[in-house]
């Protein structure tokens, strides 16, 4: 991780991808510590603030503008050397987002995947982006970059993620950049939550008053397990939405969530999953599917759940 003997290591917190108007802390780690350092920008644009200045431990940059985008290096203080400074650090690329219209991000075959599978994240736009970048929330490493392919007035790139492990679950966003401004990125795509299932034992799913109900009768689906899940997720086959509820410890030492579905109008096949607060995007095996049948005259589809769809929000904590 650290540089060579006389080479400092330059890093960015929380990320090298910074929204326009945001702040980022640059740290120059030299000789097992954070000492005084100087900062350089390779293209020499936007350097007045660095001119002849020495920074202590970290440099807080911001609010950032497109001019901040580019490659940075630092030199650590080395008082007894000829120049007084170390060799230049590794190059650190700072990317500034919010400079073009956002692209779209899709998951194939979908955002809910089993451990070990591979997912293709496709980033596309009608803006002719030269490069696309894929970034996972909370990761300080540089985003993945691919050259955009242009077909029929659309530029796109396919990022292959896998085989999926818990560490790859999370919230993804993609960005585009145009020629000649490679580090001035677009606004982020809408967030896409990649959820990995199959890591823990399956919960059980049951219906009250039962899986076959009269039209208009109130139905509640209960998801429970002996495992101390923090959150349960309920999905309905053919629907992009999932509902989630906090698990409640019961007297019989199970952990349960009761999903009120309201008056029955339409049947469907349901599954539930459990997850832990620390890893909100890593879910259990699916419960056995539960077919809810409605007898009588179904007038319309079941009311749409109001919880966030699987496109975003799953990987945020449920407060």
């Amino acid at each position: 991780l650290m540089g060579g003997q006389d080479k400092p290591f330059l890093s960015a917190r929380p990320s090298t991808v910074v929204p326009r108007g945001g702040h980022v802390a640059l740290q120059c780690h030299y000789r097992r510590g954070f000492n005084n350092f100087m900062l350089y920008k390779e293209d020499r644009s936007h350097v007045p603030i660095f001119h002849g200045r020495i920074f202590q431990e970290s440099f807080i940059m911001g609010p950032v503008t497109p001019a901040h985008a580019g490659t940075y290096r630092c030199r650590g203080s080395r008082p007894h050397s000829l120049t007084g400074w170390s060799a230049p650090s590794n190059p650190l690329v700072i990317m500034v987002t919010g400079n073009h219209r956002k692209p779209s991000l899709l998951a194939h075959p979908g955002p809910l995947l089993k451990s070990g599978e591979t997912v293709i994240l496709q980033c596309w736009s009608d803006v002719m982006f030269e490069h696309f970048f894929l970034h996972r929330e909370g990761i300080s490493e540089d985003p993945s970059r691919l050259v955009g392919q242009i077909h029929d007035g659309v530029s796109k790139a396919n990022f292959s993620i896998g085989p999926l492990m818990p560490v790859l679950a999370g919230t993804y966003r993609c960005y585009g950049s145009v020629p000649h401004s490679p580090y001035q990125l677009s606004a982020p795509s809408d967030p896409l939550d990649i959820v990995i299932t199959g890591l823990y034992e399956k919960p059980s799913l049951s219906a009250q008053p039962g899986p076959t109900v009269q039209a208009g009768e109130n139905v509640t689906l209960s998801c429970s397990s002996w495992s101390s899940y923090d959150i349960y997720h309920l999905s309905r086959e053919g629907e992009a939405h999932e509902r989630r509820l906090r698990a409640v410890p019961k007297v019989n030492r199970t952990f349960q969530a009761d999903f009120p579905l309201g008056p029955a109008t339409h049947g469907g096949t349901y599954r539930c999953f459990g997850s832990f607060r620390a890893l909100p995007c890593v879910w259990s095996n699916s419960s056995d599917p539960l077919l809810v049948s409605v007898t009588g005259n179904p007038s319309s589809s079941w009311p749409s759940p109001t919880e966030p769809s699987s496109k975003s929000g799953i990987c945020r904590h449920l407060h």
Epitope: R13, P14, E57, I60, G62, P63, T65
Partner: antibody, heavy 118, light 107 residues
Framework: QIQLVQSGSELKKPGASVKVSCKAS????????MQWVRQAPGQGLEWIGW????????KYAEDFKGRFVFSLDTSVSTAYLQISSLKAEDTAVYFC???????????WGQGTTVTVSS | DIVMTQSPSFLSASVGDRVTITCKAS??????VAWYQQKPGQPPKLLIY???TRHTGVPDRFSGSGSGTDYTLTISSVQAEDVAVYYC?????????FGGGTKVEIK
């Protein structure tokens, strides 16, 4: 949204100390710094200094070295300004503002009035 | 310390007028100039930084220009809600320093 909320007004006697707090929300506290600025009654803005919320390193303007001390409690996203041996000329509104090494202060607290009077 | 000399200290304009406030630095500040608006009883609000970059949510009637030692804030069509004191600030080198302020009033 980004917000900085400061503690309430203070009335102090000369020689006393005061500690002004500034609680930040809506952003990652340790990726920016906190600048402190004061405004005497009917006067302009005067920079006191700033603290790097990432490293905890403070920097003070020359006129404010000694009696003015910045501190942080990152666990509650709060910055503090402590002034000791208060003088009548310290009477002012004290502002915290988010900002880093580049000196741009993009979000400000509502201000804390410190009155020093015997 | 870099001294920022702001002028005028007071100006009165009619709604719709173009208003210009200038700031002169005692040395070259390499476009590291910000502008703030302060309404009575409120904290300052950032309008412009790095000479011409508008802060989030600032109406586009506010613009900044300049280089070297001379900088300008322009309100292209002043509105009643623009009544305030405007300050320039150099963010080139510490200590950051502010101009003395320009009070803008509507006739």
């Amino acid at each position: 949204q980004i917000q900085l909320v400061q503690s309430g007004s203070e009335l102090k006697k000369p020689g006393a100390s005061v500690k002004v707090s500034c609680k930040a929300s809506g952003y990652t506290f340790t990726t920016a710094g906190m600048q402190w600025v004061r405004q005497a009654p009917g006067q302009g803005l005067e920079w006191i200094g700033w603290i790097n919320s990432h490293s905890g390193v403070p920097k003070y303007a020359e006129d404010f070295k000694g009696r003015f001390v910045f501190s942080l409690d990152t666990s509650v996203s709060t910055a503090y300004l402590q002034i000791s041996s208060l003088k009548a000329e310290d009477t002012a509104v004290y502002f915290c503002a988010r900002g880093g090494d580049e000196g741009v202060m993009d979000y400000w607290g509502q201000g804390t009035t410190v009155t020093v009077s015997s | 310390d870099i001294v920022m000399t702001q002028s005028p200290s007071f100006l009165s304009a009619s709604v719709g007028d173009r208003v210009t406030i200038t700031c002169k630095a005692s040395q070259d500040v390499s476009t590291a100039v910000a502008w703030y608006q302060q309404k009575p009883g409120q904290p300052p609000k950032l309008l412009i930084y790095w000479t011409s970059t508008r802060h989030t949510g600032v109406p586009d009637r506010f613009s900044g220009s300049g280089s070297g030692t001379d900088y300008t804030l322009t309100i292209s069509s002043v509105q009643a809600e623009d009544v305030a004191v405007y300050y320039c600030q150099q963010h080139y080198s510490t200590p950051w320093t502010f101009g003395g302020g320009t009070k803008v009033e509507i006739k």
